[in-house]
């Protein structure tokens, strides 16, 4: 049975040009992380493997850093990186959770971090 | 759980439009997840032909981009298939599915054969 | 786009056989391979992720294995109603591709 949850950072806002964290984390469960999938709806960004380390995708590798821990770094954001970002978690025994973060890239100096949530 | 069927004419002519349904049981199209359009073709290969997001947002296959089109009816739980000026190239076994985050594919209807023939 | 290889159309086995079906990427897809299982009459049915990860309620008799460019489905002990065609795909990238499919017959 799957009893862990995937707290990640949310909605979040950052600024043309800038650099953001995305970070998920998997709590509630003994269940070990095999691997992280960093994904959107239409593209792998980078996947973290236990036994094999990082893969960035090609088309990413200019602009996206592996970590802090299981995260991922997206630098010289445009506006075009506006939208949702999935980190699938592959565990054992459990199977796979998934949270879910929105980024939305400003144009404006403004840009303020949402409030964290879960995702069950 | 999930449940997708594909409906269409069966029979189009060449140079014709088809227009495909895949209504979903079971789970709404605007809650989550990309409801996409495969197809088999009669010596089993099989093509993925796009996506419509739970937000509306489309993508195509390169191939098909300019033949093709994903909406959908919301207030029916229903997306669409409309594929322009076929040939007997496109005569195949039409699948909807959903898929999973990651781009895999879990959830399958049965599929609907269309000819194409004069 | 990606070009998936599965170099044997058929292959056949018996009852109880271990078997393993390949597929090939035509570039580095590191893990992001899927494997499919279609009955006769039926639509494909997931059976594998991310190179090896089994889905809800498949059986461990099966399980895959890769990464990179070469990727294995191996069945342990092969049975009657395992006949059916066996296709690979790849999550990497879009447009998202599969393999020609791999016929499994049963002596």
């Known amino acids: 049975m799957m009893t862990g949850t995937i707290e990640t950072t949310g909605n979040i806002s950052a600024e043309k040009g800038g650099s953001i964290i995305l970070q998920c984390h998997l709590s509630s469960t003994t269940a070990q992380v095999t691997q992280v999938n960093w994904e959107q709806q239409d593209q792998l960004l980078a996947i973290c493997n236990a036994d094999l380390g990082w893969h960035i995708s090609p088309s990413f590798k200019d602009r996206v850093a592996p970590g802090p821990g299981l995260g991922l770094t997206l630098q010289s954001l445009t506006v075009n990186d506006t939208g949702e970002y999935f980190c699938i978690y592959h565990t054992y025994p459990d199977g796979t959770y998934t949270g879910r973060i929105f980024l939305e890239v400003l144009e404006s100096s403004v840009a303020e971090h949402g409030a964290r949530f879960q995702i069950p | 759980d999930v449940q997708l069927q594909e409906s269409g004419p069966g029979l189009v002519k060449p140079s014709q439009s088809l227009s495909l349904t895949c209504t979903v049981t079971?789970?709404?199209?605007?809650?989550?997840?990309?409801w996409n359009w495969i197809r088999q073709f009669p010596g089993n290969k099989l093509e993925w032909m796009g996506y419509i997001s739970y937000s509306g947002n489309t993508r195509y296959n390169p191939s098909l981009k300019s033949r093709i089109s994903i909406t959908r009816d919301t207030s029916k739980n229903q997306f669409f298939l409309q594929f322009n000026s076929v040939t007997t190239e496109d005569t195949a076994t039409y699948y909807c599915?959903?898929?999973?985050?990651?781009?895999?594919?879990?959830?399958w209807g049965q599929g609907t054969l269309v000819t194409v023939s004069a | 786009d990606i070009v998936m290889t599965q170099s044997h159309k058929f292959m056949s086995t018996s009852v109880g056989d271990r078997v393993s079906i390949t597929c090939k990427a035509s570039q580095d897809v590191f893990t992001a391979v899927a494997w499919y299982q279609q009955k006769p009459g039926q639509s494909p049915k997931l059976l594998i992720y991310?190179?090896?990860y089994r889905y809800t309620g498949v059986p461990d008799r099966f399980t895959g294995s890769g990464s990179g460019t070469d990727f294995t489905f191996t069945i342990s002990s092969v049975q009657a109603e395992d006949l059916a065609v066996y296709y690979c795909?790849?999550?990497?990238?879009?447009?998202?591709?599969f393999g020609g499919g791999t016929r499994l017959e049963i002596k």
């Open positions: 079971g789970y709404s199209i605007t809650s989550d997840y990309a």
């Open positions: 795909q790849q999550h990497y990238s879009t447009p998202w591709t």
């Open positions: 599915s959903r898929k999973y985050y990651g781009s895999w594919f879990p959830y």
């Open positions: 991310s190179a090896s």
